[in-house]
Structure formats: structure tokens, C-alpha cells
């Protein structure tokens, strides 16, 4: 008989390299049987995970699995870091593995001179 426990399918050590200034959706795959659990996102700050308030979230259903999505519109440099989703199910708290976002600041990258430019300035 199939287990009806809630399961969160974020892979261990999952990572995303993303660009600041563009949108991104961070997905938490949630498997449940009858009632959809209450799911939240938090961001790791040292050993504590700070719940993300005032953030846009949504659900997406695909086949027999649901995705609880954290929307970044757009990604900001400050969004760099590790996130975790957690589900409340029958008074139990189930936590996912953390997933890490590596944010590239495209403005500072495009404004920063290349090594060649720096060298030519130095020797000019």
C-alpha cells in the first residue's frame, strides 16, 4: 500500500545559477494524497531559517505532483543564498533539503572592466 505521507522532493545539494534582473521561479515539488498541505518557504541565515513573508508564491499542478513556487520578479543580488520549503501536515512539520541560489549581478559584471581592459589601462 502506497504511503500517504507528505513528501518534499528537493534534491540534496540542489543549486541554481541565476541572473539578477530577470525573473525566476523556485519550485518545491510536493507529493500528497488527499488534502494539500500548507507549505511555506524560508531562507537560511546561519543555522536559522527565516520565514519569507510578503513574497509572491503560487501552486502549479502537474500529473500527480504539485509544485509550490516562490516567485522572484525579478531576482535581486540579495536573493543569493539557500532556501528551504516546509509543509505542515497533520500537526507534523516536514522540511525539504535546502536549495541554493547563486546570483550573478549582471550590472556590476557588465560595468566591471575585463582583465584585458585592466591590463591595457595599466600599461598605457
Amino acid at each position: 500500500k502506497e504511503s500517504c505521507d507528505v513528501q518534499l522532493y528537493i534534491k540534496r545539494r540542489s543549486e541554481h545559477s541565476i541572473l539578477a534582473g530577470d525573473p525566476f521561479e523556485l519550485e518545491c515539488p510536493v507529493k500528497y494524497c488527499a488534502n494539500r498541505p500548507h507549505v511555506t518557504w524560508c531562507k537560511l541565515n546561519g543555522t536559522t531559517c527565516v520565514k519569507l513573508e510578503d513574497r509572491q508564491t503560487s501552486w502549479k499542478e502537474e500529473k500527480n505532483i504539485s509544485f509550490f513556487i516562490l516567485h522572484f520578479e525579478p531576482v535581486l543580488p540579495n536573493d543569493n543564498g539557500s532556501y528551504r520549503c516546509s509543509a505542515n501536515f497533520q500537526s507534523n512539520l516536514i522540511e525539504s533539503h535546502s536549495t541554493t541560489l547563486y546570483v550573478t549581478d549582471v550590472k556590476s559584471a557588465s560595468e566591471r572592466p575585463s582583465k584585458d581592459e585592466m591590463a591595457s589601462r595599466f600599461w598605457a
Epitope: 541572473l19 539578477a20 534582473g21 530577470d22 525573473p23 513573508e53 510578503d54 513574497r55 509572491q56 516567485h71 520578479e73 525579478p74 535581486l76 543580488p77 540579495n78 549582471v106 550590472k107 557588465s110
Partner: antibody, heavy 120, light 106 residues
Framework: QVQLKESGPGLVAPSQSLSITCTVS????????VHWVRQSPGKGLEWLGV???????SYNPAPMSRLSISKDNSKSQVFLKMNSLQTDDTAMYYC??????????????WGQGTSVTVSS | QIVLSQSPAILSASPGEKVTMTCRAS?????MHWYQQKPGSSPKPWIY???NLASGVPARFSGSGSGTSYSLTISRMEAEDAATYYC?????????FGGGTKLEIK
């Protein structure tokens, strides 16, 4: 310096479509997003949608089914197309640059706007 | 959608007077932006992310607030401050504006 300039038809007949072009200078469409905002006497300022640097779009869910935003990076142009116009779509349409700081996002540079009147 | 309610709709102030206008959100937002608009012109960024003054904005302006309640304050009203001020949230799509506070000089 940063500039955005809208060009539109001015007058559109009811049920027809609207096409507005926003030509930008002083920044790259591959680094900054461009938004469309309209201002009408009845509805005030209304955010319509955005063309993100990477080419994705986000829309206001209310007029979303009638809206389409596209761009041509090489020409530094962003396009707004809106179908099935009604008289309450009469407004000033602005294109606006979006920019991010470390921990917030905002619209900083606004075009001068193009006035659109929907009337037969 | 998050509805932003600005009050008062119209505000009249004398030169030198302290002015405060408020913006209330129907749900909590991370921060609030403010734009100034004068007749015949496009809106101009005025205050970013609740309290950061945009470039060229006089220091007599300040912004504060959190959650669902935000305000813009002018320490001493000047004639050039007469304009309409709009609050704007970038926390949840659709990204909405308040209805505006029209500030007039007495």
C-alpha cells in the same frame, strides 16, 4: 543619458488593436527590463506588463489576455500590442525602465508618454 | 491584488508647514515606492524602497513605514512641492499604484 520614447497611433477605433513602440537609448535591453504603464482619468496609474532582460514577460492578469509585449534588442525597441480596445483603454501610455539595487526593484526612468484615444 | 489607498486625496498646505500623506496596503508589502507627478509631465521617482530619496530630491522629504502602512513627509512645505504623489508596491503581481494625493499650496 538614459532616454525612452514612445510612438503610437494617437487614435484607435473601438475593437481595433493598439501598437506602441518604445525606443530606448543610454542602456541595453539585455541588462534592464522595460515596463508599460498607462494612466487614465478613471483608473489612475496601471501597470500593464514588463519585458525582462532575458526575454521573458510578465503581465498584469486583468488585461493580460489582450496584451502582448515583445522586443528587438538590436534596435533597442520594445513593443506593446493590445487587442480589442474599448473606450476605457483611452489613456496616456508610458514605457519605463526597471532597475534593481541590492535588495529592491523599482521603475526609474519614464518616457514622456504617448496619448491614445479610443473613439469611432 | 494588493490595493493601495492614499489619504487624503487632496491636501492643502502653507509654505513652511509640515505635511504628511499616507498609503495603506490591503496586504503586507516589503517596501513602498513614491512618485511625484506634475501636470503635463511623466511621474518621477521620488522615494525608493520606503525611505531612500531619489537623486535630486530635497532633504526635506522623508519616507517611512512597514507592513501595510507607509507615509511620505515634507518637513517644510515649499511651492515647488505642489504636485500629485503616488505610492507604488513591487511585492506582488499585479504591481499596483495608489490613487494619488494631490498636494496644493495655500
Amino acid at each position: 543619458q538614459v532616454q525612452l520614447k514612445e510612438s503610437g497611433p494617437g487614435l484607435v477605433a473601438p475593437s481595433q488593436s493598439l501598437s506602441i513602440t518604445c525606443t530606448v537609448s543610454g542602456f541595453s535591453l539585455t541588462t534592464y527590463g522595460v515596463h508599460w504603464v498607462r494612466q487614465s482619468p478613471g483608473k489612475g496609474l496601471e501597470w500593464l506588463g514588463v519585458m525582462w532582460p532575458g526575454g521573458r514577460t510578465s503581465y498584469n492578469p486583468a488585461p493580460m489576455s489582450r496584451l502582448s509585449i515583445s522586443k528587438d534588442n538590436s534596435k533597442s525597441q520594445v513593443f506593446l500590442k493590445m487587442n480589442s480596445l474599448q473606450t476605457d483603454d483611452t489613456a496616456m501610455y508610458y514605457c519605463v525602465r526597471g532597475d534593481y539595487e541590492y535588495d529592491y526593484y523599482a521603475m526609474d526612468y519614464w518616457g514622456q508618454g504617448t496619448s491614445v484615444t479610443v473613439s469611432s | 491584488q494588493i490595493v493601495l489607498s492614499q489619504s487624503p486625496a487632496i491636501l492643502s498646505a502653507s509654505p513652511g508647514e509640515k505635511v504628511t500623506m499616507t498609503c495603506r496596503a490591503s496586504s503586507s508589502v516589503s517596501y513602498m515606492h513614491w512618485y511625484q507627478q506634475k501636470p503635463g509631465s511623466s511621474p518621477k521617482p521620488w522615494i525608493y524602497a520606503t525611505s531612500n530619496l531619489a537623486s535630486g530630491v530635497p532633504a526635506r522629504f522623508s519616507g517611512s513605514g512597514s507592513g501595510t502602512s507607509y507615509s511620505l513627509t515634507i518637513s517644510r512645505m515649499e511651492a515647488e512641492d505642489a504636485a500629485t504623489y503616488y505610492c507604488h508596491q513591487w511585492s506582488s503581481n499585479p504591481y499596483t499604484f495608489g490613487g494619488g494625493t494631490k498636494l496644493e499650496i495655500k
